[in-house]
Interface confidence: medium
């Protein structure tokens, strides 16, 4: 048995951040489990991590540098993400493995979610005109 | 001393309702996130529902979600637990229990607990 994962295809990170929802068909109360988020098509980065188990508070954590914060829901993760440069547009996955109770189950991958950095575009100062010449 | 007080568990026909209170003393209830439990007849404890400190995030087991509510009143320190639609395999004793560490299974005190049997 494979968990199901739902995401919105795509999200545009207007002020350099996105909340990603990754919806699981799993119930995550009382369970331990792993929730990642992974970026690219090869899945090659792992951007954020989830990880909940029954003697600890809730730990979020980025190996790779990226800024990101979690939140659990019944059936959900949501991955706030800050601090994204436009480079960093690319394919989203989202990844969930249940360590306990047994039996060990991990999700079908999904379609992934396009993260679309728009940079912020800052004003330019107004540009006045040297002296015209002859 | 920390003291969780369950009480509202009785006899209930299938079909039937109740409310379970827990009064809490001995700590800050509310900062504190809360949950339910239950332990039926030769099972082991079995999660039920968890609350946060301040209400905003609740958490059901799949066996009871959409005819159980939980819910908190922070000015009484009560917990409460609205069974609805209950079932015989809801019988069981149910714990009032202190969860420091978020909606998972973590507990750090619990009540004695308050008996709630369903049966025709």
């Known amino acids: 048995n494979k968990i199901l994962v739902k995401q919105s295809p795509m999200l545009v990170a207007y002020d350099n951040a996105v909340n990603l929802s990754c919806k699981y068909s799993y119930n995550l109360f009382s369970r331990e489990f792993r929730a990642s988020l992974h970026k690219g098509l090869d899945s090659a980065v792992e951007v954020c991590v989830v990880y909940g188990n029954y003697s600890q508070q809730l730990q979020v954590y980025s190996k790779t540098g990226f800024n990101c914060d979690g939140k659990l829901g019944n059936e959900s993760v949501t991955f706030y993400l800050q601090n994204l440069y436009v480079n960093q547009t690319d394919i989203y996955f989202c990844k969930i493995e249940v360590m306990y109770p047994p039996p060990y189950l991990d999700n079908e991958k999904s379609n992934g979610t396009i993260i679309h950095v728009k940079g912020k575009h800052l004003c330019p100062s107004p540009l006045f005109p040297g002296p015209s010449k002859p | 001393e920390v003291q969780l007080l369950e009480s509202g568990g009785g006899l209930v026909q299938p079909g039937g309702s109740l409310r379970l209170s827990c009064a809490a003393s001995?700590?800050?209830?509310?900062?504190?996130?809360m949950s339910w439990a239950r332990q039926a007849p030769g099972k082991g404890l079995e999660w039920v529902s968890w609350?946060?400190?301040?209400?905003?995030?609740?958490f059901y087991a799949d066996s009871v979600k959409g005819r159980f509510t939980i819910s908190r009143d922070n000015s009484k320190n009560t917990l409460y637990l609205q069974m609805n639609s209950l079932r015989a395999e809801d019988t069981a004793v149910y714990y009032c229990?202190?969860?420091?560490?978020?909606?998972?299974?973590?507990?750090?005190?619990r009540g004695q607990g308050t008996l709630v049997t369903v049966s025709s």
């Open positions: 229990a202190k969860s420091p560490f978020g909606p998972l299974y973590g507990f750090d005190y």
């Open positions: 001995g700590f800050t209830f509310d900062s504190a996130n």
């Open positions: 609350i946060e400190s301040h209400g905003g995030q609740t």
